[in-house]
């Protein structure tokens, strides 16, 4: 007799990350029979909304469903008609949108508000949208790439399935850098989290984690570039800001009223004797490395160690996967390779932002000159961070891997969120049990 | 500022291939939709199809079906219209244009300049 | 496919009036709480212009005397008052589904 296939028993779940610049929903699929199984979930689609974060249309809000809509037709074609009404759909909001709230409570509101009604309007099932804390963010982003990485996974290997592994279940450390907030995310070792606010206690799969964690909001890289020009500006003698951290030759005028417009430029805010000033670049790598310095405090501490700005920081523990904006950034500047040093980075970093503008443009013809003009800060600002900011050194340095995909998963907060708020991380490690009745045909 | 700048005029015989271009500057075509729109001459407009250049997804009319391909080369910065086995109603004006959210949450809109097509023995 | 019908075929007015153009689908273009219906302005040897999309939101740079409104299956485009430069063919456009079709314009003259 000719075996007949079974209709695959699948489900399927939706996380839209609703991030400071844009908007990503993510499309999930996995076994039926084998939720509690760790790296059986998988990513099947990504669709990047088209335009910026949800805290921009704070004005025209009533547009929020229109700005959703292609992307929201894309999950129900990709998913099969008789899934969607099982299908949850949630939609976490990051630091723009805490931003967002600092400044107005009720804004923020009206945004989340209409969000959860367009959402609403969907087959699926939606299970509600709010703006998740700085924390969540960075236990998820950790949960996730340990989860893909097959950290959680009790059964020794004796071959590698996955990129970065290691046959010890040493997880790897988290780094997430947004355009608002940075997260870091790790298991130190046998140290105790001196500040309770940092410390998460996990059991995973019958495991214990006590793993730190700290959002740094305001310094994702487009916060952290308003925080930049701000200080900058305040010493500038005239409307001319002359920056290291944009190519020679570049030019932009910038609106004095959307330098203010964060609540991450307050602490420089001053009366400036214009309205308007105009960055011109210089291209040079080591001031604008300085000139970045000066947004970390490091001169207070009142830990036995600390990040910046008197935040707790334990020494850093084995492996780290850097995703998001810190791949992002590295890989168009093509430095993701393991094989390259942080002296070499710094190298191609000091080239990079030396050549002249007109010569990246025509370099990087497909590139909105928008994001083509900031990665020169953006790279140095990553070096900074990571050297300065957490105190990676040369030698540790090969201990970042930059991260964008895991088995085809893209590293990020998403599928941890996910995969808390659909219970399919036990606390304990499943019993395993003979083949389920489903399998035989 | 955005501009699309389309390949020149065709001129093509029935059952020929033409293949046109659009090249955007300014903008990158990842972050939005790139339509194409065809008039024929003294005619109203006609929606063609359109391609999502980030993950090369595209929808067309099926009248074009077996007939058209929509492509994009985002390190060029540029799409394609191809149509295939040319007859005499193909000839129009084609447009490719390029409408969505931009950055700040305004709503644009851009067009190329156009391309005459015409199929004629 | 969604067949749109606008009307008046033609339309003469005089600056400073006020211009009504009504376009019809053979079925709802409303989805998910939102009307997927477009209005373009095109000027001859010129590409078309966005006015109008979903129903009632102003394309960007577009005067506020352009409004638009409607939902289900009726929609309308008002101009008022009119300019010299406005005289036009008007197109309203579905974006419900593929393919989005086009209505066949409405021309604006002076009159």
């Known amino acids: 007799t000719q075996n007949k296939a079974l209709p695959e028993n699948v489900k399927y779940g939706i996380v839209l990350d609703a991030g400071s610049s844009h908007t990503s929903l993510y499309i999930y699929k996995w076994p039926a029979e084998k939720e509690n199984d760790t790296g059986v979930v998988h990513q099947v689609e990504e669709c990047r909304v088209k335009g910026p974060g949800i805290s921009k249309f704070v004005q025209k809000v009533n547009e929020i469903g229109i700005y959703l809509t292609d992307c929201m037709e894309r999950a129900r074609e990709v998913i099969p008609r008789s899934q969607h009404q099982e299908t949850p759909v949630y939609l976490g909001a990051t630091a723009g949108m805490r931003l967002l709230r600092m400044e107005s409570e009720e804004l923020a509101d009206r945004v989340l508000d209409v969000v959860e009604r367009s959402l609403s309007n969907y087959p699926f099932d939606f299970q509600g949208a709010r703006i998740i804390t700085g924390q969540e963010e960075g236990a998820y982003g950790w949960i996730t790439i340990n989860y893909l990485l097959g950290k959680f996974s009790q059964k020794t290997r004796w071959f590698s399935i996955v990129p970065y592994e290691t046959n010890n279940q040493e997880t790897f450390g988290a780094l997430d850098l947004g355009g608002a907030s940075t997260q870091v995310t790790f298991v130190p070792q046998n140290q105790t989290i001196e500040s309770p606010d940092n410390a998460l206690q996990f059991r995973l799969y019958g495991k214990d984690y006590n793993v730190y964690t700290h959002s740094f909001l305001c310094y994702g890289k487009d916060q952290a570039l308003w925080q930049k020009l701000a200080k900058d500006i305040q010493v500038a003698s005239n409307e001319i800001l002359r920056d290291p951290c944009f190519h020679p030759g570049y030019k932009k005028v910038v609106n004095v009223s959307d330098l203010y417009k964060t609540p991450c430029t307050k602490r420089f805010e001053m009366t400036l004797p214009f309205q308007q000033f105009e960055i011109q670049g210089i291209g040079n790598y080591q001031q604008c490395h300085q000139s970045i310095l000066e947004l970390f405090n490091t001169s207070y501490c009142p830990y036995s160690q600390c990040a910046f700005n008197g935040i707790f920081l334990p020494p850093l523990q084995g492996d780290f996967g850097a995703f998001s904006a810190f791949y992002f950034v590295m890989k168009f500047l093509n430095l993701t390779s393991e094989k390259v040093s942080q002296e070499k980075v710094t190298e191609m970093m000091k080239k990079f932002c030396a050549q002249p503008w007109e010569e990246i443009k025509t370099s990087y013809a497909g590139v909105k000159e928008k994001y083509l003009s900031e990665y020169c800060f953006s790279g140095t600002y990553i070096l900074s961070l990571l050297l300065q900011g957490y105190h990676f050194t040369a030698d540790s340095w090969e201990h970042i891997h930059f991260i964008g995909k895991i088995q085809g998963s893209d590293a990020g907060w998403t599928l941890g969120y996910m995969l808390n708020l659909t219970n399919m991380i036990p606390a304990e490690q499943p019993l395993s049990t003979p083949l389920s009745h489903s399998t035989y045909v | 500022q955005v501009q699309l700048l389309q390949s020149g005029a065709e001129v093509k015989k029935p059952g020929a291939t033409v293949k046109i271009s659009c090249k955007v500057s300014g903008f990158s075509i990842k972050d939005t939709y790139v339509h194409w729109v065809r008039q024929p001459p003294e005619q109203g407009l006609e929606w063609i199809g359109k391609?999502?250049?980030?993950?090369?997804?595209?929808k067309f009319d099926p009248k074009f079906q077996g007939r058209l391909t929509i492509t994009a080369d985002t390190s060029k910065n540029t799409a394609y219209l191809e149509l295939s086995s040319l007859r005499s109603e193909d000839t129009a004006v084609y447009y490719c244009?390029?409408?969505?959210?931009?950055?700040?949450?305004?709503?644009?809109?851009?067009w190329g300049q156009g391309t005459l097509l015409t199929v004629s023995s | 496919d969604i067949v749109l019908t606008q009307s008046p075929a033609t339309l003469a007015l005089s600056v400073g009036q006020r211009a009504t153009l009504s376009c019809r689908a053979s079925?709802?273009?409303?989805?998910?709480?939102?009307?997927?219906m477009n209005w373009f302005q095109q000027k001859p040897g010129q590409p078309p212009r966005l006015l109008i999309y979903a129903a009632s939101n102003q394309g960007s740079g577009i005067p506020a005397r352009f409004s638009g409104s409607g939902s289900g299956t009726d929609f309308t485009l008002t101009i008022n008052p009119l300019e010299s430069e406005d005289f036009a063919v008007y197109y309203c456009?579905?974006?419900?589904?593929?393919?989005?079709?086009f209505g066949p314009g409405t021309k604006l003259e002076i009159k």
């Open positions: 391609i999502d250049p980030a993950n090369v997804n595209t």
């Open positions: 244009a390029l409408y969505g959210y931009d950055d700040d949450a305004y709503y644009f809109d851009y």
């Open positions: 079925e709802s273009v409303d989805n998910y709480g939102i009307s997927f």
């Open positions: 456009q579905q974006s419900k589904e593929v393919p989005y079709t």
